[in-house]
Interface confidence: low
């Protein structure tokens, strides 16, 4: 199945050129998407190419600039946020990245009514998080780990919390592990729908062990970075949830929301908060052993000014075959009755599907079903539910948007996107306006990405928002590789793979093979998306075949495949890559003396174990920022899949699944090990231990470190990294430079 859209080739073949590494490093063939910043049912904001903030009204067809690029430039603003009453805009500048989602910034408030910045009671700097209330123009912000409230931008702030302390107590923002592994946000506060209440989390990291590493910088002495970071089995953060009435914040102060008794009996996590109404909130909790999740619906008791979470409104989700949920436990989408909700969880056949919960989880009504998975619920209105799935034509790596009519009985289902641009678009996401009056579809491929605007009632396309015409023109004279997505059936396991083939691919010839692997639990690499990246270059210019394989542990193909790796990381993921390689060799066009594997992060772990598998299949391989022992990685992630590193739990497999334990097996492969010294996520410790084990075993290997670089190896390091890896592979495959 060739997924690239066919292009009319220029009759003069010599005008076509291969991709170069420079193309990739310069981002020459990057694409744009268009996500409207919705501000009502029919209006959205968008930052124009010349940096004006423009308001578009779909129904009148009119647009006007609400904030000029001159105003933006006056404070060097890189981002903005309009207050819901449209009186003020916050302007964000001095962006300073912290971890994956978190950053600090300076904020200025601009008054649209008089065209001036608000003077007096200016915001402190740098601020860790700031947001408007959902109605009006109240502001909540976090500064130095404490939460502050302003009724109006020019008012003095009301301080809500006082115990915030760097690396100790976090209010309204997550600590490292909650940010990376649980919430996946930079914030931990949530306004109620009309702005009456503000809920927030407090994380106490006082007893958490600290990871310390050197940051070399330019000074005479390196700085030491200290992060409270719970590794597997270590002491975890203690979380509490509070809610404060923002109208009268001083009246009773923050009220703690009770934790369900069955959760509070042992170590636990808070996983998400969803407001239902101004006086009803839904909290999700998770046991430290992450196979039991409790969803708790709590109501405000006016007489006591407290939050009550009756046991009758506790819903338990439990997995008997793995962990609860997919990567995270799914969040509920409430219906208009403010008590029933829609939620994705495993059905009886082990596929993640949408269920409707009215009273108890046991009586849940299954809304979708089949040997495919519902992936995201975008919006529930009074008569429709919009969701994405990989049902269409049985390709797990696709995403289409569906509408289920819940207003009629029996409900009917319609695929909104399946036939829109079938060859070009098979992987969609969507963004909905209020009440789903309109929505934007963003197609990521396999053809060139395109973003379109649609009527929420009829699904009619209204206009193209971004079609990447410049990219299309730039690619006209490029010899792109061919891509196929197919599957292998092996021992009752389906292994989907994507193969990237050189432009002049000839089945009768032999090609070097590079396996690109990630393979982490609940991940998916084989997706019908557009990309012109390093591996595209390796196929186009260097004549390599590149393959990506989704083996056991990967997502969206049912629990049997997903939970196969439960408590056994590092076994089946590796086996399945090896099995696929053997199948590729059988296809006849792979030079079995020139096979390599590479991966980053979890992929670095898998590639290292594959190289050390003793199969003799791989000539060489690369591990970038690999995990080397699960005892070195974060508790929340690791224990979800591995349990605890204790004798009476799973210590034995923690010890057996390290890269270091297989040091001897690297003797017959060429291994390139790469890591950033300031990696806050997968600590440099992981590669240091691999290197030490290889040295102790007297095994030769190559290595590269990137000073002061984190897990992303960004900036100039990226160029150096890909240049270095290219040389390594070309040498391994005996390709001339």
């Amino acid at each position: 199945i060739v997924l690239r859209p066919s292009r009319v080739h220029n009759s003069e073949e010599n005008t076509m050129r291969a991709l170069t590494l420079k193309d990739i490093l310069n981002g020459t063939f990057s694409y744009k998407t268009f996500f409207p910043n919705w501000i009502s049912g029919q209006e959205y904001l968008h930052q124009s190419a010349d940096n004006n903030i423009v308001l578009y009204n779909i129904e009148t067809g009119q647009s006007y600039t609400i904030l000029s690029n001159r105003t933006m430039k006056s404070v060097n603003a890189s981002n903005y946020g309009l207050s819901p009453d449209r009186q003020f805009v916050y302007l964000e500048s001095d962006y300073s990245k912290l971890w994956r989602y978190s950053y600090t910034a300076t904020y200025y408030i601009y008054d649209l009514s008089n065209g001036e910045f608000v003077r007096g009671n200016e915001l402190p700097r740098p601020i860790q998080y700031l947001c408007w209330s959902p109605v009006g123009s109240k502001l909540a912000y976090v500064y130095q780990n404490n939460i502050y409230l302003k009724q109006r931008p020019g008012d003095p702030p009301f301080q809500i919390t006082f115990n915030g302390r760097e690396n100790k107590i976090f209010n309204g923002i997550p600590d490292w592990v909650y940010e990376e592994e649980m919430l996946a946000t930079k914030y931990a506060l949530w306004w109620s729908p009309n702005g009456k209440f503000l809920a927030y989390a407090e994380f106490n990291d006082t007893d958490i062990p600290v990871i310390a590493y050197s940051y070399y910088g330019d000074e005479q002495y390196p700085r030491t970075i200290n992060i409270p970071y719970p590794k597997a089995g270590a002491k975890n953060p203690v979380v509490r949830i509070f809610i404060i009435d923002t109208t009268y914040p001083a009246y009773v102060g923050p009220q703690e929301v009770p934790v369900p008794a069955m959760i509070a009996s042992s170590d636990y996590y808070f996983s998400w908060l969803t407001w239902v109404t101004d006086e009803r909130v839904c909290l999700q909790w998770l046991k430290r052993v992450q196979n039991v999740s409790v969803l708790s619906i709590c109501d405000f008791r006016e007489d006591w000014q407290t939050w009550d979470c009756p046991k009758t409104q506790e819903h338990i989700e439990e997995s008997r075959t793995g962990w609860a949920g997919g990567f995270f436990v799914s969040t509920p989408v409430f219906s208009y009755d403010a008590i029933s909700y829609y939620k994705i969880f495993s059905d009886k056949d082990g596929y993640k599907h949408i269920h409707y919960i009215k009273d108890t989880v046991e009586n849940a009504i299954q809304i979708t079903s089949g040997k495919w998975e519902a992936i995201n619920i975008f919006r529930v209105t009074q008569d429709s539910l919009f969701y994405s799935s990989n049902e269409f034509e049985e390709y797990p790596g696709r995403r289409n948007i569906y509408r289920i009519s819940i207003g009629s009985y029996p409900p009917s289902k319609k695929c909104v996107t399946c036939h829109l641009r079938k060859e070009r678009c098979q992987y969609y996401t969507a963004s909905f306006s209020d009440y789903a009056k309109y929505y934007a579809l963003v197609c990521y491929g396999p053809g060139i990405p395109i973003s379109t605007l649609h009527d929420g009632r009829t699904d009619q396309e209204i206009k193209i928002l971004e079609e990447n015409k410049e990219l299309e023109n730039a690619l006209k004279n490029i010899q792109l590789p061919k891509e196929e997505i197919k599957k292998l059936e092996v021992d009752e396991i389906t292994l989907w793979y994507k193969m990237i083939l050189p432009p002049q691919f000839d089945r009768s010839k032999k090609y070097p093979l590079l396996i690109q692997v990630y393979g982490g639990p609940c991940s998916q690499s084989v997706r019908s998306v557009f990309a012109v990246n390093w591996i595209s270059y390796l196929a186009s210019k260097e004549g390599m075949v590149i393959a990506l394989v989704d083996g056991r542990g990967t997502a969206f193909q049912g629990d049997k495949l997903l939970y196969a790796v439960y408590r056994k990381l590092g076994v089946y993921e590796v086996e399945d890559q090896i099995t696929a390689v053997r199948k590729f060799i059988e296809m006849g066009f792979i030079d079995e003396k020139r096979i390599a594997i590479w991966g980053w992060s979890y992929g670095g772990y898998v590639s290292s174990l594959a190289l050390a598998s003793g199969t003799g299949l791989f000539k060489c391989g690369i591990a970038v920022a690999p995990v080397s022992s699960w005892e070195y990685y974060a508790s929340v992630y690791t224990e979800r899949f591995m349990g605890l590193p204790t004798k009476d739990d799973n210590l034995e497999h923690y010890k057996n699944s390290t890269v270091m334990a297989r040091a001897e097996y690297f003797r017959n492969v060429d291994y390139l090990l790469i890591h950033g010294t300031a990696d806050d996520n997968v600590h440099f410790q992981n590669s240091a231990q691999i290197a030490k084990a290889l040295v102790n075993a007297q095994v030769d290997f190559q290595a590269m470190w990137y000073s002061d670089q984190n897990h992303g190896l960004s900036g100039l390091s990226t160029n150096h990294l890909y240049t270095h890896m290219t040389h390594f592979l070309k040498q391994c495959f005996s390709l001339s430079d």
């Epitope: 009886k348 056949d349 009504i365 299954q366 979708t368 079903s369 040997k371």
Partner: nanobody, 123 residues
Framework: QVQLQESGGGLVEAEGSLRLSCAAS????????MGWFRQAPGLERELVAA???????YYADSVKGRFTISRDNARNTVYLQTNSLKPEDTAVYYC?????????????????WGQGTQVTVSS
């Protein structure tokens, strides 16, 4: 949309057997969960047996070991083989269908129904 038509009911002596059939018309039969319910005079309609689209089966405790549910997707038909029948098995037997899982015992969770077929077990 799926339409259902039951057949195979009748009068049988205790310890006897019957094979009930339910023919479905409409598209995508294989994607529906199918169930057999029964309703005796003056009693609630109760789930007897159900089978998911993937072939997983569920039985009420009162019929376990005696009744067997099966499906033939090629023929768009679901069967209920009833053995060792007892007088208390006397009821109108209804075929039902739903999109989704099969482990749902409440009548409200099954949107599609047949007309029913009478099974009478004499002592």
């Amino acid at each position: 949309q799926v339409q259902l038509q039951e057949s195979g009911g009748g009068l049988v002596e205790a310890e006897g057997s019957l094979r009930l059939s339910c023919a479905a018309s409409g598209r995508a039969f294989g994607s529906y969960a199918m169930g057999w319910f029964r309703q005796a005079p003056g009693l609630e309609r109760e789930l007897v047996a159900a089978i998911s689209s993937g072939g997983t089966t569920y039985y009420a405790d009162s019929v376990k070991g005696r009744f067997t549910i099966s499906r033939d997707n090629a023929r768009n038909t679901v069967y209920l083989q009833t053995n060792s029948l007892k007088p208390e098995d006397t009821a109108v037997y209804y075929c039902a269908a739903r999109t989704g899982g099969a482990a749902y015992t409440r009548r409200i969770d099954w949107p599609y129904w047949g007309q029913g077929t009478q099974v009478t077990v004499s002592s």
